[in-house]
Every structure is written in C-alpha cells, then in structure tokens.
Interface confidence: low
C-alpha cells in the first residue's frame, strides 16, 4: 500500500505513461488540410504529459503502443449539408519522419456531422501525427465537439 502511494507522487512521464488530450486551435491555409491543435492547463480540459506540440502537430516522445482517439464535429452542419458536401473525410496518420509516413485512421462523414474513432497502434519517438480534414466544411472549435488525444498503453 505504501509503495502504491509513493508511485502516485511520480510525474506521469517518469512512469512511461505519456498522454495528451488536445483541442482544436485553428485550421491551416487552403492547400494545407491539417488541423492545428493546442493543449495545456490554461486552456481547460486539455493537457500534454510527455508528447509535445510542434506547430500545432503532436509529436511522440516515447516508443510504445498508443491508443489514438479523435472526434471532429463539423461547424454549421446538418445531415443535409454533410451529404451535399460529400466527401468530407478525416485522416489521422504519421506525417513525419517521411520514412514512417502512414495513414492510421480514415473516416468519412457521409451524412453525419460528427465522426469519432480510436485505435491501438505502435508509435515511435519522433513520430509526428497529422490530422487531415479534406472537404469544404470547417470543424467546430467547441472543446466538447472536437478533440484529439493519445495515451501510452504499453511498450
């Protein structure tokens, strides 16, 4: 029991339990499909323990298997507009280093205004995750509608 209490005093990073929960900062210019994220206690219910944000993109600092999750809600959207603007798609992938570039998640909005998904995937130190939203509709910045995160699960 005493050992378990002592463990709780250690920072999350030292336990190898890297975790991040991010909220949308802004979208990129027209030819840049990436979503730009932000995180930190000053912003409310978002945080980074281990991973870092570089120019709004999430970079992994510890090798391991991660749970990656994302929810994106389109702003000013109804099922009618969503189907009319089809295809609007969201893709999450490793965008750098180039040698590890791969798509991890790909989702289409079809006739809905919100998509959410998660998966377990191995990630390595230095991997940068990009979230690409293609289509003409813009995402909501409401923190309970659009969010993105990773959680280290095991080596």
């Amino acid at each position: 029991q005493r050992f378990a209490q002592a463990q709780q005093q250690l920072p999350l990073e030292s336990l190898g339990w890297d975790v991040a929960e991010l909220q949308l900062n802004h979208t990129g210019p027209q030819q840049d499909p990436r979503l730009y994220w932000q995180g930190g206690p000053a912003l409310g219910r978002s945080f980074l323990h281990g991973p870092e944000l570089d120019k709004g993109q999430l970079r992994i600092h510890r090798d391991g298997i991660y749970m990656v999750h994302i929810q994106v809600t389109l702003a000013i959207c109804s099922s009618t507009t969503a189907s009319r603007h089809h295809p609007t798609t969201l893709a999450v992938g490793i965008c750098s280093p180039a040698s590890r570039s791969i798509s991890l998640l790909r989702l289409s909005f079809h006739q809905g205004c919100t998509i959410a998904s998660q998966r377990l995937t191995p990630l390595a130190r230095g991997d940068t995750l990009c979230t690409n939203l293609t289509g003409t509709l813009l995402p909501s910045r409401n923190t309970d509608e659009t969010f993105f995160g990773v959680q280290w699960v095991r080596p």
Epitope: N25, H26, G28, P29, Q30, Q31, D32, Y36, Q38, E52, D54, K55, G56, Q57, R59, C95, S96, P97, A98, S99, S101, G126, T128, C130
Partner: antibody, heavy 125, light 107 residues
C-alpha cells in the same frame, strides 16, 4: 518580391519593454503556409529564434524567452510585432524579422527564407 | 532543446578549394536541417533546406547531405563571395535552434 523591414527604438532602458514592428511589403501577411518569425543575434554571437506567429494568431515561442515575449499580427497593416519585457543587457542584439515558411510537402519542413536587414537594439541606461 | 554543434568553428581556405562544414544534432532530426550564409553586417541567407535541397537562386556549388544527427554543407569550388559565416538550423522541434556558426576566411 516579398520584403521585410524592422522598425523600433535602437535604445531601451533596463527593465523596460523592447518593442519592434516588422512591415511586410510585396505580399500579404495572410498568405497561406507562412509564419512570421523573430530571430536575434547578440554582437559577435550566433542566432537565436525568439518565436513565430501564424496570420490567424497562433504563436510559437522559444521557452527560454516565452514568459517575456509577446508576438502579435496586424493583417490590416501587413505587420507583425515583437514585445520583450523586463530587458537586461543580455537582450542587446540585432533583431531580425523573417518569413517562416512551412513547405507543404509530405513532412512539412520549415525555413526562414526571407529576412529583414535587422535592427540593432541596445539595452543600456 | 536540441543542440546543434558545428565544426570547425573557423577555417581558412583559398579560392577554388573544396570546403566541407559539418553539423551534428544532439538527437535525431531526420532531414529537418537548413543551412544559412551570413556576411558581416547582413542578414542570413537561406542556402539549403531539408538537408539537401538547394534554395532557388543559390549557386549549385553549394550542396548539403546527411540525415539523423550528422549533416554536411559542401562548397565544391570556393569563390570570393563565399567568404562568410555559415549556420545550420534544425526545424524538427521547438525551439528552433542554430549551430554556433563556421567562419570561412581567406587563407
């Protein structure tokens, strides 16, 4: 072509705030894929990145200076600005503004591809 | 922060010489490495981006190579206008950091 020009006082007293403005000509500060950055170079020394701003207002700072730095953008004037508070003699440097260009390839490298000519700022009483 | 270390700090060379400057990162930065040239009293000028790509308008006598932690800038045949200080810079991680510079002087 795009040109950058720094302006601001060349002499600032210790503990005061250094304020510089960079005016962009020959192109829009709102152009896609460009950040706008500040870099400084103390006399006889190397280059230090201070921070960069995206036209929408997203900012990225050097953590060693973050608590003292404010970078803002005024798209209507095609300008971006630097404020550095509580300056000391160690902040004496040539301050450069630069276009911080993110190349939209698969892995998004970025460069400082266009620079202003620099402005010398001395911190002294 | 990622530390960038250049060597040598200075070198003397003659016109026509082949000159190589090295830059080492304190951790792997993939190909996120840029090279700049700075002449006295002037702003730096971008030469090479993403380790090996020549910036538009820059002479082809400049070339860059490397990946991971070790990078080189090569000037194939030094010209009088190449006497300057050269800086490497990583764009892998914030904060963006520069090497301390290599001054190329006339022998």
């Amino acid at each position: 072509q795009v040109q950058l020009q720094e302006s601001g006082p060349g002499l600032v007293k210790p503990s005061q705030t250094l304020s510089l403005t960079c005016t962009v000509s020959g192109g829009s500060i709102s152009s896609s894929s460009y950040y706008w950055g500040w870099i400084r170079q103390p006399p006889g020394k190397g280059l230090e990145w201070i921070g960069s701003i995206y036209h929408s207002g997203g900012t990225y700072f050097n953590p060693s200076l973050k608590s003292r730095v404010t970078i803002s953008v005024d798209t209507s004037k095609n300008q971006f600005s630097l404020k550095l508070s509580s300056v000391t003699a160690a902040d004496t440097a040539v301050y450069y503004c630069a276009r911080h260009y993110e190349i939209l390839t698969g892995y998004y490298p970025d460069v400082f591809d266009i620079w202003g000519q620099g402005t010398m700022v001395t911190v002294s009483s | 922060d990622i530390q960038m270390t250049q060597s040598p700090s200075s070198l003397s060379a003659s016109v026509g010489d082949r000159v190589t400057i090295t830059c080492r990162a304190s951790q792997s930065i993939s190909s996120y490495l840029n090279w700049y040239q700075q002449k006295p009293g002037k702003a730096p000028k971008l030469l090479i981006y993403a380790a090996s790509n020549l910036q538009s308008g820059v002479s082809s006598r400049f070339s860059g190579s490397g990946s991971g932690t070790d990078f080189t800038l090569t000037i194939s045949s030094l010209q009088p206008e190449d006497f300057a200080t050269y800086y490497c810079q990583q764009s892998f991680s914030s904060p963006r950091t520069f090497g301390q510079g290599t001054k190329v002087e006339i022998k």
